[in-house]
């Protein structure tokens, strides 16, 4: 279990030790003001009490100031994501100050030791911010701390210790081990800044969760449920690197939070939207695509400030690479009769046809089971903007197309050999677009033919009432 009381071991061991002089040792925490997008360019080093570098390097007191805080490191050197993030911030906010917090000597340790160093690094950042606050025109409200992994909790400590309140902290997959369930002041929390937004991309409910599972911000966004990220499977990383390993999968999923944030900076015209939901399963059912009462938000840099009384967990699906944006649809299918279903859950696919494009064949994920005489809700998403939807093709996969279903079919036949043909009846499909918040009802092409059975398809066209807006707020509209 963790060593109580942080940086120098147990609390009672924290006696005041004399500090080493500047000539003896390089400081463990350095503040590198990045004056160029070029990672080879050295930039300027800032230190508390020394105003000259601020002037020499044109530190803009009235502009936004970003502090990028790395996490635990096995290599002891800056990773590529950091340079990409610096470059993206410079591209998006040309006048801003971008400061890289270099705590590599304290992070290149055993993980437990690096964790125990987070408090002291947070304190160093707070001291730097307290000193900057003494300057005319510098405002803590313009400060945005961006921390990855262990760096997210360092940002939390900085926000905790600083005199005043920083404007924003973004936690990019905050570290899980030794922080899950930790005291509010011992991890990133909503109290640490005026707005704390968090991206969770490597959470696991089984085994070791590299990223923290519990919400720690004002808004906590869980792309793809916060666990398995598209493009990060063993097959994917095996294809892209010479020696694919589990380590690469971990890195891919954990680091995905950074790339989602970079994407939000550089692909401003393709924002990804997340939707508030109590849990991942409900989101997968398509229940949570509302934008009412601040229930949706942009992710990453463009997130709108939300300070709810209670934490807001938000979900979205993404593509496997940049730009990560997808288009979410809620599909409500009312099954009004059900014939000889047996024990097999049907496997449905839909194809959406729009004014701009047609989708691929998309599976309808049955999270629990198909209910009869009830409305069943599904989530589907497309990588391309289909425009206005025109028609939908619903296909019921035949048993032979799935080994699992074939086996269940066979078992069902053994117990009920004279089981007549299975079918169900669907009159209409209601669709809601997450991105536009528009709703549309589709009716069967032939009102007399509403039945569907394995290996068959049903076509639905827009019903006469067309698109309905129903007082929903589009996420593309500025949220309050």
């Amino acid at each position: 279990s963790p060593v109580p009381f942080g940086p120098e071991g147990r609390l009672e061991d924290k006696l005041h030790k004399p500090k080493a002089t500047q000539t003896e040792v390089k400081p463990s925490v350095r503040f590198n003001l990045r004056t160029s997008k070029d990672p080879e360019h050295e930039g300027c080093y800032l230190s508390v009490g020394h105003s000259q570098p601020l002037e020499d390097c044109s530190f803009n007191m009235t502009a936004k100031t970003f502090f990028i805080i790395h996490g635990w490191t096995m290599s002891g050197i800056f990773e590529n994501w950091l340079h990409k993030l610096v470059s993206a911030l410079h591209t998006r906010e040309k006048d801003a100050n971008v400061v890289v917090v270099d705590w590599l000597p304290l992070a290149h340790q055993l993980y437990t030791d690096a964790v125990n160093n987070t408090r002291v690094v947070g304190h160093s950042i707070a001291r730097m911010l307290d000193w900057l606050q003494e300057k005319d025109d510098f405002s803590l409200g313009n400060v945005h701390l961006i921390g990855y992994s262990l760096g997210a909790h360092v940002a939390g400590y900085a926000g905790n210790f600083v005199k005043g309140t920083v404007g924003r902290i973004t936690g990019l997959d905050p570290a899980g081990p030794m922080f899950e369930g930790a005291d509010i002041h011992k991890r990133l929390s909503p109290d640490d800044a005026d707005f704390v937004d968090v991206l969770h991309t490597y959470t696991r409910s089984f085994g070791l969760s590299i990223g923290i599972q519990m919400p720690v911000g004002h808004i906590d966004i869980y792309p793809n449920g916060g666990d398995f990220q598209p493009g990060c499977g063993l097959n994917d990383v095996l294809g892209s690197i010479a020696y694919g390993t589990i380590t690469e999968v971990v890195k891919c999923e954990h680091e995905r939070a950074v790339h989602l944030f970079v994407d939000s900076l550089v692909n401003q015209d393709k924002p990804s939207f997340a939707f508030q939901c109590t849990d991942s399963n409900r989101f997968k059912k398509g229940i949570c695509l509302s934008c009412r009462k601040n229930r949706c938000n942009s992710i990453g840099y463009n997130a709108k400030k939300m300070r709810n009384k209670r934490n807001s967990k938000m979900y979205l699906k993404t593509r496997a690479g940049m730009p990560f944006r997808v288009y979410h649809y809620q599909m409500k299918i009312h099954v009004f009769s059900y014939k000889n279903m047996g024990e097999i859950e049907p496997t449905f696919y839909v194809t959406l046809y729009g004014t701009n494009a047609d989708s691929q064949t998309l599976p309808l994920e049955i999270v629990e089971r198909i209910e009869q005489n009830a409305t069943n809700t599904f989530l589907v998403y497309t990588e391309e903007d289909l425009g206005d939807l025109l028609k939908i093709q619903l296909t019921w996969e035949g048993a032979s197309q799935s080994w699992y279903n074939l086996w269940k079919e066979f078992r069902s036949y053994l117990s009920q050999p004279r089981n007549p043909g299975r079918e169900l009846n669907i009159r209409r499909i209601r669709v809601k677009s997450g991105e536009t918040q528009r709703k549309l009802t589709f009716c069967t092409e032939d009102p007399e033919n509403t039945s569907i059975s394995p290996g068959r398809e049903l076509w639905f066209r827009k019903c006469r009432d067309g698109w309905r807006m129903k007082n929903e707020t589009s996420p593309t509209v500025e949220l309050p």
Epitope: L11, D183, M214
Partner: antibody
Framework: QVQLVQSGAEVKKPGASVKVSCKAS????????IAWVRQAPGQGLEWMGE????????KYNKKFKGRVTMTRDTSTSTVYMELSSLRSEDTAVYYC?????????WGQGTTVTVSS | DIQMTQSPSSLSASVGDRVTITCKAS??????VAWYQQKPGKSPKLLIY???YRFTGVPSRFTGSGAGTDFTLTISSLQPEDFATYYC?????????FGGGTKVEIK
């Protein structure tokens, strides 16, 4: 070792104020939150609020807001809790506790009696 | 505010007994729960933090478990020095809130 030493017992009249002190030693005073928790006779524990000595940031239980003030003196590593407009229900033992993993270390408690 | 409801409010047990105390949060607090022991006339002592981690010097007979809204403190074999009052507390959000306490008495 970590120690929190509180001031002595107080007897106050209704409407008066009381100021309890808590002197910390054995750790870096400025970077750990110190909470105040009270316990009425025969009752459970009630969190009143906490202070971070380095920045003097405070968090208060809204039940006590307006009546409680927490301050610190970094030169003596001491925190103070002042409760005003005392009433008989404020009769309790008041504890200070330093937070890291939880309330890791507690003071010995200060008994405050409110009686006319 | 998050309410913490502890049960039972008191129990009688003998030395060597296995004792279980439960705590229920009014909303999800994940694993951000601590347990304290308080003896008459003494200050509380931290036993368990983050739902299941024993604090320094706490005997292994004390075990914490649970996540979400339901938490348990178990004393595997009650010792004479364990007769005391036990409190749970959520440390997920401010205001911090305590359970009402469970008094463990000698049967």
């Amino acid at each position: 070792q970590v120690q929190l030493v509180q001031s002595g017992a107080e007897v106050k009249k209704p409407g008066a104020s009381v100021k309890v002190s808590c002197k910390a030693s054995g750790y870096t005073f400025t970077t750990y939150w110190i909470a105040w928790v009270r316990q009425a006779p025969g009752q459970g524990l009630e969190w009143m609020g906490e202070i971070l000595p380095g920045s003097a940031k405070t968090k208060y239980n809204k039940k006590f807001k307006g009546r409680v003030t927490m301050t610190r003196d970094t030169s003596t590593s001491t925190v103070y809790m002042e409760l005003s407009s005392l009433r008989s229900e404020d009769t309790a033992v008041y504890y200070c506790a330093v937070y890291d993993y939880g309330a890791d270390y507690w003071g010995q408690g200060t008994t405050v009696t409110v009686s006319s | 505010d998050i309410q913490m409801t502890q049960s039972p409010s008191s129990l009688s047990a003998s030395v060597g007994d296995r004792v279980t105390i439960t705590c229920k949060a009014s909303q999800d607090v994940y694993t951000a729960v601590a347990w304290y022991q308080q003896k008459p006339g003494k200050s509380p002592k931290l036993l368990i933090y983050s739902a299941s981690y024993r604090f320094t010097g706490v005997p292994s007979r004390f075990t914490g478990s649970g996540a979400g809204t339901d938490f348990t403190l178990t004393i595997s074999s009650l010792q004479p020095e364990d007769f005391a009052t036990y409190y749970c507390q959520q440390h997920y959000s401010i205001p911090r809130t305590f359970g009402g306490g469970t008094k463990v008495e000698i049967k």
